[in-house]
C-alpha cells in the first residue's frame, strides 16, 4: 500500500539534488583556491540536516546555522552587487568584473542557485514530488528560509557603495515583495553603507526614457534615504554594450553613455 504523502503546490526537490549540491561544492572549491579547505561531505551533511526529517513549513534560520558556519568566506564588503529580477545579467557582469560579487558567486549561493528542496516530517526521505509554495502553502519552507537567511547576511556584510541591478522591463522596477525589496534593502547597515547605487537595465532597443524617475525607483529612494543611506541611480540603456565595455573599457565607443 503506497504511503500517504503531503501534496504541496510547488515543484518537488530538483532531481539528483544531493549529487548536484556535492558536485557544485567540489567544483567551487576547485575554482576558488581560498575555499579548497572546505570538506564538501560535511557541507552536504549540514545542508541535509537543515531540512531532512523536518516539517517543510516549519524551517527556521537556526536550522541553517551549521551550514552557515561551514560556508564562512571572505567577501570584500565594498564589492557587493545585489540584483532583482535580472539574475542572468548580474551574473554575466560579475563573470567579467571578477572583483565584484553577487550572492551566487559565494559558496552558499552557488550551491543552491536555481534548486528546490524539501523533506518530510519524521522521515529521512527527500520529497521529489512536491514542495511548499511560498504563497500558496507557507513562507517558512526550506528554500525560502535559506534565501532569506543568506540574503540578509549578505546585505549585512555590505559596506561603502553597494550596487543593485534592477530590471527596467518590469512593471515594478523596484518590487517591495522581492528578496531585494523585503530583505536586503532593510538589512543594509547605515553605519557601514554610504550609498546604494541602482543600475536600471533597459530592455528595449529604442527605450530612451529616464527610468530613474519611475515611481517605484522613487519609492526605493525614499526607503533608502529614511535609513540614512544615500541613493543614486543610473540608466543602463544598452546592456549588451554595457557588458562589452566592462570587458573592454578602453574601447573608444565606451566613453559615451551606455
Amino acid at each position: 500500500v503506497p504511503r500517504w504523502r503531503q501534496q504541496w503546490s510547488g515543484p518537488g526537490t530538483t532531481k539528483r539534488f544531493p549529487e548536484t549540491v556535492l558536485a557544485r561544492c567540489v567544483k567551487y572549491t576547485e575554482i576558488h583556491p581560498e575555499m579548497r579547505h572546505v570538506d564538501c561531505q560535511s557541507v552536504w551533511d549540514a545542508f541535509k540536516g537543515a531540512f531532512i526529517s523536518k516539517h517543510p513549513c516549519n524551517i527556521t534560520e537556526e536550522d541553517y546555522q551549521p551550514l552557515m558556519k561551514l560556508g564562512t568566506q571572505t567577501v570584500p564588503c565594498n564589492k557587493i552587487l545585489l540584483w532583482s529580477r535580472i539574475k542572468d545579467l548580474a551574473h554575466q557582469f560579475t563573470q567579467v568584473q571578477r572583483d565584484m560579487f553577487t550572492l551566487e558567486d559565494t559558496l552558499l549561493g552557488y550551491l543552491a542557485d536555481d534548486l528546490t528542496w524539501c523533506g518530510e516530517f519524521n522521515t529521512s526521505k527527500i520529497n521529489y514530488q512536491s514542495c511548499p509554495d511560498w504563497r500558496k502553502d507557507c513562507s517558512n519552507n526550506p528554500v525560502s528560509v535559506f534565501w532569506k537567511t543568506v540574503s540578509r547576511r549578505f546585505a549585512e556584510a555590505a559596506c561603502d557603495v553597494v550596487h543593485v541591478m534592477l530590471n527596467g522591463s518590469r512593471s515594478k522596477i523596484f518590487d517591495k515583495n522581492s528578496t531585494f525589496g523585503s530583505v536586503e534593502v532593510h538589512n543594509l547597515q547605515p553605519e557601514k553603507v554610504q550609498t546604494l547605487e541602482a543600475w536600471v537595465i533597459h530592455g528595449g532597443r529604442e527605450d530612451s526614457r529616464d527610468l530613474c524617475q519611475d515611481p517605484t525607483i522613487k519609492e526605493l529612494e525614499s526607503i533608502i534615504s529614511k535609513r540614512n543611506i544615500q541613493f543614486s541611480c543610473k540608466n543602463i540603456y544598452r546592456p549588451d554594450k554595457f557588458l562589452q565595455c566592462v570587458k573592454n573599457p578602453e574601447d573608444s565607443s565606451c566613453t559615451s553613455e551606455i
Partner: nanobody, 117 residues
Framework: EVQVLESGGGLVQPGGSLRLSCAAS????????MSWVRQAPGKGLEWVSS????????DYADSVRGRFTISRDNSNNTLYLQMNSLRAEDTAVYYC??????????RGQGTLVTVSS
C-alpha cells in the same frame, strides 16, 4: 568607517593560554554582533566564535568549544577571545569582524597566534 585593531597574539606552548583583544571604532559597537575568525597558514577562513551586541547570544565552532571564551565590553568598544588549552592546530592569524557571517570582510591586520613547543 568600521575599523578594528586586534592584539594579544604570540608564541605559546601547547596547553597554554592567550587572551586576544579587538578595539573597534567607527560604528556603534553595541548594536553589532561580532565574530572571531581565523586563517591558518595555507588554509581558508574559519569561523571561530560569535557574540550578539548585548552578549545574550554566543556561539562557538565545535573545534574550540569548551576551550575558548568570547566576551565583549561595550563601554570600551572591545571584543575579547580567551583561549585556553591551546593546540598546534589553533595556530593561525586571528581576525575580529562585525556580524556573524558567513560573509566576512575583516578590516584589521589580525594577530598571529603560534602554538608550538
Amino acid at each position: 568607517e568600521v575599523q578594528v585593531l586586534e592584539s594579544g597574539g604570540g608564541l605559546v606552548q601547547p596547553g597554554g593560554s592567550l587572551r586576544l583583544s579587538c578595539a573597534a571604532s567607527g560604528f556603534t559597537f553595541s548594536n553589532y554582533a561580532m565574530s572571531w575568525v581565523r586563517q591558518a597558514p595555507g588554509k581558508g577562513l574559519e569561523w571561530v566564535s560569535s557574540i550578539s551586541g548585548s552578549a545574550g547570544s554566543i556561539d562557538y565552532a565545535d573545534s574550540v568549544r569548551g576551550r575558548f571564551t568570547i566576551s565583549r565590553d561595550n563601554s570600551n568598544n572591545t571584543l575579547y577571545l580567551q583561549m585556553n588549552s591551546l593546540r598546534a592546530e589553533d595556530t593561525a592569524v586571528y581576525y575580529c569582524a562585525d556580524g556573524t557571517g558567513p560573509f566576512f570582510d575583516y578590516r584589521g591586520q589580525g594577530t598571529l597566534v603560534t602554538v608550538s613547543s
